[in-house]
């Protein structure tokens, strides 16, 4: 099976420290999903990333870096409308057992005040596999630039699998995409969090099959209400 690209899928290592809100959700020492730091106590990720307990890696672009913060988390709150059948409302808040220490390498992500339009250039990042279907996991955080795709254009590919709180992104005729292990990680556009990695076709990186993300701008009220409720 041909290796599809050599980073994320067809990306490159992120500029060091450029994604200080990026976290990794680990199961033991093993990468499970990506996520983003919303504030000192909360991480936002995908609902399909749910586990009983998480170890959250923050503060380093390198998994396994001893200088990174590692914080346990045992409480998580899925969006109540998440469906394991359609994967609509694929987002979840994870409450850290202790507060993250903010620094130049650990910062809160900016939640969106508006939904960015199709054509906007965004960056998706993660420690997910750089090859597919056979997996190759990098130790350094990878980034790839993609463009937001209109729901009309994305529906041509995914038909009724696409729900209205899902956001598509990709580059025509390109393999640039997220893959296994990137789930729940950030799609950042113009400095704000617009998407969380949700799903895509497999093997990853098939040209003209966009990545599908949870559209965060549709959920800011739920995010803020949930953090307030479970303070």
């Amino acid at each position: 099976e041909e290796a599809q690209g050599d980073k994320i899928i067809d990306g490159a290592p992120c500029a060091r420290g450029s994604h200080p809100w990026q976290v990794a959700l680990l199961s033991g020492n093993q990468l499970h999903c990506g996520g983003v730091l919303v504030n000192e106590r909360w991480v936002l990720t995908a609902a399909h990333c749910k586990m009983n307990e998480y170890t959250v890696h923050l503060g380093s672009d390198t998994l396994g870096d001893r200088r990174a913060q590692r914080i346990k988390a045992s409480k998580s709150f899925r969006h109540p409308g998440y469906s394991t059948q359609t994967h609509v409302n694929d987002l979840m808040l994870v409450k850290l057992n202790s507060q993250a220490r903010l620094s130049s390498m650990v910062k809160k992500v900016r939640l969106p005040s508006r939904c960015e339009p199709p054509g906007t250039t965004c960056t998706v990042s993660g420690w997910g596999t750089t090859t597919s279907p056979d997996v190759t996991f990098p130790s350094d955080l990878m980034c790839v630039d993609v463009k937001l795709i209109s729901p009309q254009d994305c529906t041509k590919v995914y038909k009724d699998l696409l729900e209205n709180s899902m956001l598509c992104a990709g580059i025509p005729d390109s393999k640039k995409n997220a893959c296994n292990g990137d789930s729940g990680g950030p799609l950042v556009c113009r400095g704000t969090l617009q998407g969380l990695v949700s799903w895509g076709t497999f093997p990853c990186g098939q040209p003209n099959d966009p990545g599908v993300y949870t559209q965060v701008c549709k959920f800011t009220k739920w995010i803020n209400d949930t953090m307030k409720k479970h303070r």
């Epitope: 749910k50 059948q85 296994n180 799903w199 497999f202």
Partner: antibody, heavy 122, light 108 residues
Framework: QVQLVQSGAEVKKPGASVKVSCKAS????????ISWVRQAPGQGLEWMGW????????NYAQKLQGRVTMTTDTSTSTAYMELRSLRSDDTAVYYC???????????????WGQGTMVTVSS | DIQMTQSPSSLSASVGDRVTITCRAS??????LNWYQQKPGKAPKLLIY???SLQSGVPSRFSGSGSGTDFTLTISSLQPEDFATYYC??????????FGGGTKVEIK
């Protein structure tokens, strides 16, 4: 080597329960789902349901809802399928299959267990 | 639920023959169709995913085509080890997943 190894054949009486295991080896269990598929003697393949290895999320075929439970134990990389209130028409070979995909959605079954024959007879 | 209909249900062919099996979905499934081969007493084995992508290790005499509702599995030159039953499934659908009824390829 990458494989799914299932538990051995079972003979059960009508009304009883059966629990079939499926142990994964040679790959990281967590990121994948496991589906269960059964095949009655001389018949085609019937999808029974799916479970996410990490989250325990499940989807069951409607006709089996209430009788089937799928679970996983990530510490041993093992999936289980329990079928209750067995009837003679549950006599079949039961297969576990790795569901390949990324993120929330899976697309095909790229690795299968060897099958477990379950006979329901009084 | 999406229904998958395979035809023919069985066929007889000789070694070296070109064999074609079709699978029809009850509604469009784009190109998200898979083909499996099953030999007697054995587990199914993935041959083709995404309508036309050959699974690693599968001989190139197997090929798949189609999109929307109509799909084809072709064996360009039938070999003795290809006598088996072939199933399609429409992976595009959210659960439940339905398999086609199967096509048994027998020796003429």
């Amino acid at each position: 080597q990458v494989q799914l190894v299932q538990s051995g054949a079972e003979v059960k009486k009508p009304g009883a329960s059966v629990k079939v295991s499926c142990k994964a080896s040679g790959y990281t269990f967590g990121p994948y789902g496991i589906s269960w598929v059964r095949q009655a003697p001389g018949q085609g393949l019937e999808w029974m349901g799916w479970i996410s290895a990490y989250s325990g999320d499940t989807n069951y075929a409607q006709k089996l809802q209430g009788r089937v439970t799928m679970t996983t134990d990530t510490s041993t990389s093992t999936a289980y399928m329990e079928l209750r209130s067995l009837r003679s028409d549950d006599t079949a070979v039961y297969y576990c299959a790795r569901a390949a995909g990324y993120g929330a959605r899976w697309w095909y079954f790229d690795l299968w267990g060897q099958g477990t024959m379950v006979t329901v007879s009084s | 639920d999406i229904q998958m209909t395979q035809s023919p249900s069985s066929l007889s062919a000789s070694v070296g023959d070109r064999v074609t099996i079709t699978c029809r979905a009850s509604q469009s499934i784009s190109s998200y169709l898979n083909w499996y081969q099953q030999k007697p007493g054995k587990a199914p084995k993935l041959l083709i995913y995404g309508a036309s992508s050959l699974q690693s290790g599968v001989p190139s005499r197997f090929s798949g085509s189609g999109s929307g509702t109509d799909f084809t599995l072709t064996i360009s030159s039938l070999q003795p080890e290809d006598f088996a039953t072939y199933y399609c499934d429409g992976s595009y659908s959210t659960p439940p997943i339905t398999f086609g009824g199967g096509t048994k390829v027998e020796i003429k």
